[in-house]
């Protein structure tokens, strides 16, 4: 079958845009660390990179193959306000590279880490 | 309290990066339409813009305030392969602007649409 060049070009573009790669996501700090309900962070979220996107097959999962850790400073506010906002430094995992891995390999990898 | 300029700059940067705005996300087409298990799409995902990010308060939600519609062409493959890939066109809404809205307003808005 012959397909219009425009269609093939736009499909190729979609492949590239949706591939498994590190993507900027917003992490809600309070939810991530499960802090007390009277503790708030300003800003409430931080921007980190996490693996995301689609793999070419149902049996594959987009997983990180390397990680770097970075620290970010936020203000922590505890209610009632007995003192002003306190700067706190929090460390986050940043996914720096990703790969489509078989779900079975991912399962094995996770379980070998748990077993250690 | 006086805070280090570097800290204030990095916090300001975090606010900007995590604010409520249109963000590129990948939508798995097969899962979106719940198609038959022998129907596959190539690429399996499309890239769309959806409102995302964080609002400054628990009672606020990041919602779209304007939308544009666009179409993308993908290939649909039915297994067993009795014929080649067939082009299909997918139309969807892209969020073009967003705002932090009170959850109560969002609830009212959704219910007024449903009632129409």
């Amino acid at each position: 079958a012959h397909y219009n060049t425009e269609i093939l070009k736009s499909i190729d573009n979609e492949w590239r845009k949706t591939q498994c790669m590190p993507r900027e996501v917003c992490i809600d700090v309070g939810k991530e660390f499960g802090v007390a309900t009277n503790t708030f962070f300003k800003p409430p979220c931080v921007s980190v990179y996490r693996c995301g996107g689609c793999c070419n097959s149902e049996g594959l999962q987009c997983m990180n193959t390397s990680t770097s850790y970075l620290s970010k400073t936020l203000f922590e506010i505890t209610v009632p306000l007995s003192q002003g906002p306190k700067p706190v430094t929090i460390s986050f995992a940043n996914h720096t590279s990703c790969r489509c891995m078989s779900k079975l390999d991912v399962y094995r990898q996770v379980h070998s880490i748990i077993r250690r | 309290a006086h805070y280090n300029t570097e800290i204030l700059k990095s916090i300001d940067n975090e606010w900007r990066k995590t604010q409520c705005m249109p963000r590129e996300v990948c939508i798995d087409v097969g899962k979106e339409f719940g198609v038959a298990t022998n129907t596959f799409f190539k690429p399996p995902c499309v890239s769309v813009y959806r409102c995302g990010g964080c609002c400054n308060s628990e009672g606020l939600q990041c919602m779209n305030t304007s939308t544009s519609y666009l179409s993308k062409t993908l290939f649909e493959i039915t297994v067993p392969l009795s014929q080649g890939p067939k082009p299909v066109t997918i139309s969807f809404a892209n969020h073009t602007s967003c705002r932090c809205m009170s959850k109560l307003d969002v609830y009212r808005q959704v219910h007024s649409i449903i009632r129409r």
């Epitope: - | 979106e32 719940g34 139309s91």
Partner: nanobody, 118 residues
Framework: EVQLVESGGGLVQPGGSLRLSCAAS????????MGWYRQAPGKQRELVSA???????LYADSVKGRFTISRDNSKNTVYLQMNSLRAEDTAVYYC????????????WGQGTQVTVSS
């Protein structure tokens, strides 16, 4: 148990129109996605059109511009307006529903015959 009732099929001349409808019942939830497949004699079942609650609509290129899918959420019903019908549109048309979070199963209707012939 989810049940789908289709109607609107029949015999029509080339260039004519038909409107298929499919009503889902038996679930307390609204389907996340609803759509239509078709199967011509001796051929595979193929996806024709679908619509999702996420605001997505899909058309096979062979029907694009001629067929229009729509749904009425209050009635859990999906419609397929078929215009400018051609002989190659002759098939049994099957409706399906998908509930996503509540139920990953896909439910099928019994099918309704559409015949385009002069």
């Amino acid at each position: 148990e989810v049940q789908l009732v289709e109607s609107g099929g029949g015999l029509v001349q080339p260039g004519g129109s038909l409107r298929l409808s499919c009503a889902a019942s038996g679930s307390s939830f609204s389907p996340y996605a609803m759509g239509w497949y078709r199967q011509a004699p001796g051929k595979q079942r193929e996806l024709v059109s679908a619509t999702s609650s996420g605001g997505f609509t899909l058309y096979a290129d062979s029907v694009k511009g001629r067929f229009t899918i729509s749904r009425d959420n209050s009635k859990n019903t999906v419609y397929l307006q078929m215009n400018s019908l051609r002989a190659e549109d002759t098939a049994v048309y099957y409706c399906y529903t998908y509930y996503r979070e509540y139920d990953p199963e896909m439910y099928w209707g019994q099918g309704t015959q559409v015949t385009v012939s002069s």
